[in-house]
């Protein structure tokens, strides 16, 4: 008995396709093993016809496709514009055609049913409309035009030209007739049902000189498009419509198991609470096409998902739909990271953000989500150093730890932080990423004062405490751009058996600016790293002034005032389109700083660690 | 929500044949699923055939116990499963239930991935 299973027989009819699911038994070996689909010949021999490896035989180019789902245990064959040709017996199989795991498969492909000679037939999804054309001749030009529908051995009336309609068909059809000339007449339905399915019959005049062409109507559900996402990662849902329903309210909902479709979001501002801070329904095209993303993929996400439209925002029969199957694979590459994230008001948070690894030049962002109406991200910051103007001197964006992994740092938290941010580049858009950040109750861990102003020409010092739990921590201490923190040089920061037995005396880092230049004014940040990964940080604003009274200025780390009022800088507007998925800026028009100019420079700045005795019992 | 009631159970000699019907009540679209399983005297319940749908294509699944003897079908317009088995065998003996599923995605193998279940048919088959 093969440990390989799939249908033993499938079948259908010209011009449609298959989608055949092939079973096997996820050991590791099978996962990554060749898959294949293959046709039995006379000969008994199995002549491939494709294969995971990328083979297409010539017969199939064009129409099908093997995708494996490893995870699942799966893999499946796509057939489209199937041939009566095509019937046949097939294998399905792992490993070698010849000896191998496989399944014996039966396609039959047949001509469909019976239809009347000259039968036109149309083949038009759900909630699509169909135009049907109907011939006459001349004399009947002047007598009644009229649709009807056979249900069995009878003629139901659909439409005619004395402005019948049947209820079944009330508000979306019409028969149109031509001017003088021109032959033919048509019925265009709209927003086509399941029911609608069926063998119609047009007709013109009456009597034996009447005119009849029989129209065969396939309406059908759409194929579902199978989707394979990583856990953790992200999926992006493209809809497309139709410009029938371009100002039509739209949505997403996903299937449940009594065959109901629960909205997920929609544009009248409905969203499902499981996708909080997780999903974004980007601005409409003029075409009515718009897009989903949804982020931090769980595995409870997997289903059947249709995108649609109705005035009501919701799945309504009749009206156009697409579908998505989402798998989620649980052997993601996208590493596990923290999602949620919490600190303290007036302190700090380092958010890691993953990236494609083989992405490490791409462009790295971090945005806000807002669950405001269809949801929006607006661009904080980004590896290029544009800032929003409320961040400046409390965000930045760092490369590092690299290989993978870039860090966001977010300080003077205020209770306005709390909310959902995702991590995003301009590369792999299944590599975005959400973290949530959380205000709790607590006092921040580094301890700087808040206003300092110093003198030009003097020499500044400005203490940072940090406590016991990070001394073994690099201390260091940066002056912020919109670029990023420029780490500034740092002096002998005393002997290190103080930090391991953690002396009171000394837990405390210092920034010395000496002398202090008009360069000099802006943010600095004092924190603390472990290699690459970094931790708390503490801001602090210095204003420069000319010089009033001589000698240094030192400043006490217990008068931790706010911040002062945040520097107006020039800001330069930048226009995000809304070609929204491609576009990683997701659907904002936002304000950017530009750079703050010069960084303090080198030989005049430095980071002593030393003893809060040194400092002159300012800290007393 | 769908409900479902099998007929056609009974008590057969071995080699006999029998058709067990499946009539589902309730909305059911162009595309799902209606499987057979059984489950005879002390033993677990066993896939034994079924019968996938989407639009103007079918896919039939068969255990390989059954392969050659059982034929699963549909009467898409009464709504109805048949499955026709020929070629009875003792070890056939087992309480044969129908279950539906709207979705078309699930292992047609695996109980858990139908939604509906009727209530059973005894079939017997006597040596």
């Known amino acids: 008995k093969s440990p390989v299973f799939g249908p033993q027989e499938v079948s259908s009819v010209e011009g449609n396709s298959v989608s055949i699911k092939c079973y096997y038994p996820p050991t590791s070996v099978n996962r990554h093993t060749r898959k294949y689909w293959c046709r039995k010949g006379a000969s008994g021999r199995c002549i491939t016809l494709v294969s995971s490896e990328g083979y297409v035989s010539s017969n199939y180019a064009g129409r099908a496709n093997l995708t494996n789902f490893p995870e699942n245990g799966t893999f499946v064959v796509n057939i489209a514009q199937l041939s009566r040709d095509d019937s046949g017996h097939y294998k399905c199989g792992l490993g070698i055609n010849s000896r191998g795991l496989s399944f014996d498969v039966s396609l039959e492909v047949s001509q469909g049913p019976e239809l009347p000679n000259g039968t036109e037939v149309y083949t038009v999804d759900v909630g699509r409309t169909v135009t049907i054309k109907c011939p006459f001749k001349t004399e009947n030009a002047p007598k009644t035009k009229a649709l009807y529908k056979k249900i069995g051995q009878t003629s139901v009336l659909v439409i005619d030209s004395r402005n019948y309609v049947n209820p079944n068909y009330k508000d979306r059809i019409r028969l149109r007739i031509p001017g003088t000339g021109q032959l033919i007449f048509t019925v265009v339905i709209d927003r086509l049902r399941l029911s609608d399915h069926g063998l119609y019959l047009c007709q013109a005049g009456d009597g034996s000189n009447r005119d009849e062409k029989n129209a065969d109507l396939q309406v059908l559900e759409p194929e579902p498009e199978l989707v394979y996402e990583d856990l953790r990662g992200s999926v992006t849902f493209h809809c497309a419509l139709g410009l029938e329903v371009a100002n039509v309210a739209k949505f997403l909902c996903r299937v449940n198991s009594r065959e109901t479709c629960d909205v997920v979001i929609n544009t009248l501002g409905k969203r499902d609470s499981a996708f909080e801070g997780r999903i974004l329904l980007n601005p409409q095209d003029k075409d009515g096409s718009f897009s989903v993303v949804i982020t931090g993929l769980r595995k409870e996400d997997e289903g059947r998902y249709l995108c649609g439209a109705h005035s009501d925002g919701q799945l309504q029969e009749g009206w156009p739909i697409q579908a998505w199957q989402l798998f989620v694979n649980e052997e993601s590459t996208i590493p596990r990271s923290p999602t949620v994230v919490k600190g303290v008001a007036g302190g700090s948070v380092a958010v890691l953000c993953p990236y494609n690894p083989k992405e490490s030049q791409s462009l790295k962002y971090w945005c806000l989500w807002e669950g405001a109406q269809n949801g929006r991200c607006p661009l904080l910051v980004e590896s290029q150093g544009l800032v929003q103007e409320q961040y400046e001197g409390r965000l930045s964006l760092l490369q590092e730890p690299g290989n993978g992994t870039f860090t966001v740092i977010l300080n003077q938290l205020t209770t306005q932080d709390a909310g959902f941010y995702w991590c995003l580049t301009n590369g792999d858009t299944r590599w975005r990423t959400t973290v949530e950040i959380k205000i709790i109750e607590g006092e921040p861990n580094l301890k700087v004062p808040g206003n300092v102003t110093a003198v030009l020409g003097e020499t500044l010092n400005i203490p940072c405490h940090f406590p016991c739990k990070f001394s073994s921590y690099e201390k260091y201490w940066c002056k912020w751009s919109n670029t990023g923190c420029q780490t500034l040089p740092s002096q002998d920061e005393g002997p290190s058996e103080a930090f391991v037995n953690c002396d009171e005396n000394s837990r405390l880092v210092s920034l010395t600016l000496n002398p202090v230049t008009r360069a000099d004014e802006g943010w600095y940040w004092c924190g603390v790293k472990q290699g690459h990964f970094y931790g708390e940080t503490a801001a602090v604003y210095v204003a420069v002034e000319e010089k009033k009274v001589a000698g240094s200025r030192y400043v006490s780390p217990a008068k931790a005032d706010a911040a002062p009022d945040e520097k107006v800088l020039d800001s330069g507007v930048r226009e995000i389109e809304n070609k929204a998925i491609q576009d990683p800026r997701l659907f904002a028009e936002e304000k950017v700083v530009a750079d703050t100019g010069d960084q303090a420079g080198g030989s005049r700045a430095s980071v002593d660690s030393s003893s809060s005795e040194e400092q002159g019992g300012s800290s007393k | 929500e769908v409900q479902l009631v099998e007929s056609g159970g009974g008590l057969v000699q071995a080699g006999d044949s029998l058709r067990l019907s499946c009539a589902a009540s309730?909305?059911?679209?162009?595309?799902?699923?209606m499987g057979w399983f059984r489950q005879g005297p002390g033993k677990e319940r066993e896939f034994v055939a079924a019968l996938m749908w989407r639009n103007t294509v079918t896919y039939k699944y068969y255990e390989d116990s059954v392969k050659g003897r059982f034929t699963i079908s549909r009467d898409n317009a009464k709504n109805t499963a048949y499955l026709q088995m020929n070629s009875l065998k003792p070890e056939d003996t087992a309480v044969y239930y129908c279950?539906?599923?709207?979705?078309?995605?699930?292992?047609?193998?695996?109980?858990?991935?139908?939604?509906?279940w009727g209530q059973g048919t005894l079939v017997t088959v006597s040596s």
């Open positions: 309730g909305r059911t679209g162009s595309s799902g699923a």
């Open positions: 279950a539906a599923d709207p979705d078309t995605y699930g292992d047609p193998r695996n109980s858990g991935a139908y939604d509906y």
